[in-house]
């Protein structure tokens, strides 16, 4: 009786209804249902569709833009519960832009595990006013319920036994307002009583057993389950999953071989995207969890010691990195198994995207080759490397190469860097903005030095063109108030004074103490610092009143750390010698200063005697929080509120519903229809500024949904004929 | 030549006012900060508070706050401290300073009664 | 606030002698710090700003040292004028404090 039909995987039905038959045996869609995109179907086509076996959907429905269809009263008449594993935009039904949908009609629906719901832009959809949705579903006030035609209050939405004058379906109370439950004319929403919890209630209004999840045949009886608030085994729920069983998709048990199944289905299919399903913590899942590898023996997931390895085997032994995408296909490889050549000449973000993708490689066996990538400012991108073996070496004996890099201006930070190179010798030419300084430092940390032949590290063409500042700058003075710095640092002086061109200062919002100068830079515009051109200052021929230069940095962040640094700008002399100085990388926190205001006061009162006030923490705290003052103050009555008969007739409902103390505004917009007097004489008052804001985030939030949505269902048409479903990437 | 020169010292009775004068020359006034920091007699030094001559912004010890108060008459060149309800312990030599590097000689002044 | 507390609070020496003087942080000021010489009825004079760089003007004999918490003024070969009382200063964190003062007194 438990989930009679198939367990069926995620399905992805668009254009036309033909997969729709895919539906025909399954009871539960171990998965995504997404019913979409369907432009010429008209009413009658979905006349006979009906899939009543369908129980439950393990991730999310969506429907969207399906003509014709009227109600999902025939289509899943028996839809009891949807479990939310994985949610589209945090959401667990999505009912959006259908054209022709007058009401959902879901009438067993009892259960939306997690996540909310999103109904909108369906302009003939009525009987969402009569749902209780917190019958349903725990987070309410999440739901998103607008632009339907229930908001235009032009539903004459009635429930069972209303025209007779009865009232069939129980009714409850949102928002103050008691109101009927139902789903369509002729179906009620089931309401258990409150007892009962989500395990569901039978027709007489006994509770199911505990195990149970929405609705059951008969009470107390975990085999008569509609389905399994925990997981399902052999036609009962249980609260756990018993060995030798192993839990699966949240929801269900299997043994050993099934999973195991899975694992070697996976790795023999050399699919992309399958997943070679592992053990781990009683659960049969797709992957290891970060910091465990598997056990190729028992598919067991082992802790790692130390950093998981994945060791990579690079097709012919080596790879050309020459764009993101090609970088991401060694993201998360720990060990290459051979030698990889950089060739980045341009794009966006590099510095972020090489080091998400090339940051956990500790270990390369071959050479590495860092060839004409104009792009690359640093290395610091291979923030893990600590070994090149050289087991493989470049033409000439080389395990490490930098030719032609005219950006190039660190190699790693070699104050937080480790780096050995078992064997072979180092190659720099054409590296104009690296200073020699940085090679020979690298000679030393990698243990290469002295295995360098004279022409490997070329004199005249490595930092021909850098200021290879060879003199530290100090800062003399530090002053800050909360939204200023103010810098002076010693003064500088090249031996020509004419060639100092001025000072950079660079700076930026830096929470922890570990950033480095090339952090987020590279030669594409991408740079992390906050960057000021600062004239030098006046030369005075008295060495007692040379000016220090400095810097009033403005319109900072208050009580926020930031990370600064100055460095020279001096023109390049005629003897290829270059001067400067740099100064280390300071951290200076702006001061406190008067929080913003505490959001969302909310106040009730509880009784005769007592006001309750709440509020959220301010959005610019601006420094530690330590108190909240509260003031309050005594008010005159207002005497028309005695002078005023009550009894009078004519008196307007409020405009305004009571609503319970502190539920979110969210919930109330969402679900709550508010009597307005349109007939009045009074005009709309003028929207205050949170409301103009509220307005415009709540458009913004809009469409970052609609770009989510668009971006996840329009898909490129496949090429070649396959039933396969799209991929959409759920969240 | 950088140069700062206090006055408006002297003698006051516990309870009552004085507006010290910082007078600033040899340098742009505007672009660097004036502190003030005070000495009382055979004590170490002790730290005020600073003023902005470019924006007028201040900062003050939370020992003075709301009895001393910066001010600024940019067309002079000269920076001021005013102090209310002095007391004895108030006693002492006060300098004003260019970011640390430049003091003033400093003035004398004495809470008694 | 940041207390700085300065070592020996006196110390006697002749001319000549090298003299350290100490100035530990209550907490890390990175190398904020300043060494002051005055003399009775005179001005602060600034000799070191950020922990060892010496302004100018300054003779050579003097030099700092240290970071974090632990900071030294040294004077290599004390001279007859170099008799004052020294004090440091932080300018890591408002309110900037300065040490007690240390007087170097001929013997």
């Known amino acids: 009786h438990l989930y009679p039909g198939e367990v069926c995987p995620g399905m992805d039905i668009r254009n036309n209804l033909t997969r729709l038959h895919e539906l025909e045996n399954c009871s539960v869609i171990e998965g995504h249902l997404q019913i979409l995109l369907m432009f010429k179907t008209r009413p009658e086509d979905f006349r006979d569709l009906s899939f009543p076996k369908l129980i439950m959907i393990t991730d999310y429905l969506l429907l969207f833009r399906v003509y014709g269809l009227e109600s999902l009263k025939d289509l899943f008449p028996n839809l009891t519960v949807i479990r939310g594993s994985r949610l589209f935009f945090n959401y667990a039904l999505v009912i959006f832009e259908m054209v022709h949908l007058k009401e959902l009609g879901l009438y067993n629906l009892m259960n939306i595990t997690r996540g909310s719901v999103r109904i909108e832009k369906n302009n003939e959809l009525c009987y969402l006013a009569t749902i209780d949705w917190s019958r349903i579903l725990d987070s309410v006030e999440d739901n998103y319920i607008v632009l339907n035609k229930d908001d235009n209050e032009e539903c004459g939405d009635i429930c069972p036994g209303t025209a007779k004058g009865k009232t069939n379906c129980p009714a409850t109370v949102i928002n103050g307002q008691f109101v009927e439950r139902c789903w369509t004319h002729s179906h009620c929403q089931k309401v258990c009583p409150t007892i009962c919890k989500s395990h569901g209630c039978t027709a007489e209004g006994l509770c199911c057993h505990s195990e149970c999840l929405g609705n059951c045949s008969q009470p107390d009886d975990p085999t008569k389950c509609v389905a399994c608030r925990n997981f399902y085994l052999d036609g009962r729920c249980v609260e756990t999953c018993p060995p030798p069983y192993y839990h699966f998709q949240d929801w269900r048990c299997v043994n050993f071989s099934f999973c195991q199944d899975l694992h070697h289905k996976c790795k023999n299919s050399r699919r992309q995207g399958c997943h070679q399903y592992v053990i781990h913590n009683n659960k049969c899942i797709p992957e290891c969890p970060s910091g465990y590898t598997m056990n190729s023996s028992n598919l067991l997931c082992t802790p790692c010691l130390g950093p998981c390895p994945k060791v990579c085997h690079l097709l012919e032994g080596e790879k050309t990195i020459d764009s993101v995408t090609s970088a991401q296909e060694l993201r998360g490889c720990t060990v290459i198994n051979g030698s990889l050549i950089i060739n980045i000449r341009g794009g966006n973000n590099l510095a972020a995207e090489l080091e998400a993708n090339l940051g956990l490689i500790e270990e390369i066996s071959g050479y590495l080759k860092i060839r004409r990538s104009y792009a690359l400012v640093s290395l610091s991108f291979f923030r893990k490397l600590r070994l090149i073996r050289g087991e493989t070496l470049e033409i000439g004996n080389y395990s490490f190469y930098a030719l032609d890099n005219q950006n190039l201006r660190q190699l790693w930070d070699w104050s937080k860097h480790n780096l050995t190179i078992t064997q072979g010798k180092l190659f720099f030419h054409y590296n104009p903005k690296l200073c020699l300084s940085e090679i020979h430092k690298m000679e030393e940390v990698s243990g290469t030095k002295g295995r360098q032949e004279r022409n490997d590290i070329a004199l005249k063409t490595n930092g021909d063109q850098a200021s290879c500042e060879n003199e530290l700058l100090k800062f003399s003075y530090i002053r800050t108030s909360f939204d200023k710095i103010l810098l002076r640092w010693e003064p500088y002086w090249p031996p020509d004074f004419r060639d100092l061109l001025g000072f950079m200062l660079f700076y930026k919002e830096a929470p922890y103490q570990n950033v480095t100068e090339f952090d987020g830079q590279d030669a594409c515009g991408s740079n992390s610092w906050t960057v000021v051109d600062i004239d030098p200052p006046l030369r005075s021929n008295d060495p007692k009143s040379q000016n220090h230069p400095g810097w009033l940095m403005r319109g900072l962040k208050p009580w926020t750390q930031y990370a600064i640094f100055v460095k020279t700008l001096v023109t390049f002399s005629d003897e290829r010698r270059t001067y400067g100085a740099k100064s280390d990388i300071i951290y200076v926190q702006t001061d406190a200063t008067n929080p913003s205001v505490p959001l969302d006061p909310i106040s009730v009162s509880n009784s005769s005697s007592q006001i309750i006030l709440k509020w959220k923490p301010p959005s610019d705290p601006n420094g530690n929080i330590t108190h909240y003052l509260v003031f309050w103050e005594r008010q005159a009555e207002d005497s028309e509120l005695f002078e005023l008969d009550y009894c009078l007739k004519g008196l307007k409902l409020p405009s305004r519903t009571w609503s319970p103390p502190f539920e979110s505004e969210d919930s109330q917009k969402h679900n709550q229809s508010e009597y307005e007097d349109s007939a009045g004489e009074c005009c709309s008052c003028p929207k205050t500024d949170s409301q103009i804001l509220k307005e415009l985030e709540e458009s913004s939030f809009r469409k970052t949904f609609e770009d989510y949505l668009h971006n996840v269902v329009f898909v490129p048409r496949k090429t070649s004929s396959g039933t396969g479903a799209e991929d959409p990437r759920p969240s | 030549e950088v140069q700062l020169v206090e006055s408006g010292g002297g003698l006051v009775q516990p309870g009552g006012s004085l507006r010290l004068s910082c007078a600033a020359s040899g340098y742009d006034f505007t672009n660097y900060d004036i502190h003030w920091v005070r000495q009382a007699p055979g004590k170490g030094l002790e730290w005020v508070g600073w003023i902005y001559p470019g924006d007028g912004s201040t900062k003050y010890n939370e020992k003075f706050k709301g009895r001393f108060t910066f001010s600024l008459d940019t067309s002079k060149s000269t920076a001021y401290l005013q102090m209310n309800s002095l007391r004895a312990e108030d006693t002492a030599v006060y300098y004003c300073?260019?970011?640390?590097?430049?003091w003033g000689q400093g003035t004398l002044v004495t809470v008694s009664s | 606030d940041i207390q700085l507390t300065q070592s020996p609070s006196s110390l006697s020496a002749s001319v000549g002698d090298r003299v350290t003087i100490t100035c530990r942080a209550s907490?890390?000021?990175?190398?904020?710090l300043y060494w002051y010489q005055q003399k009775p009825g005179k001005a602060p004079k600034v000799l070191i700003y950020?922990?060892?760089s010496l302004d100018s003007g300054v003779p050579s004999r003097f030099s700092g040292s240290g970071s974090g918490t632990d900071f030294t003024l040294t004077i290599s070969s004390l001279q007859p004028e170099d008799f004052a009382t020294y004090y440091c200063l932080q300018y890591s964190s408002s309110p900037w404090t300065f040490g007690q003062g240390t007087k170097v007194e001929i013997k």
């Open positions: 950020a922990t060892s």
């Open positions: 300073a260019k970011e640390w590097a430049y």
């Open positions: 907490q890390d000021i990175g190398g904020n």
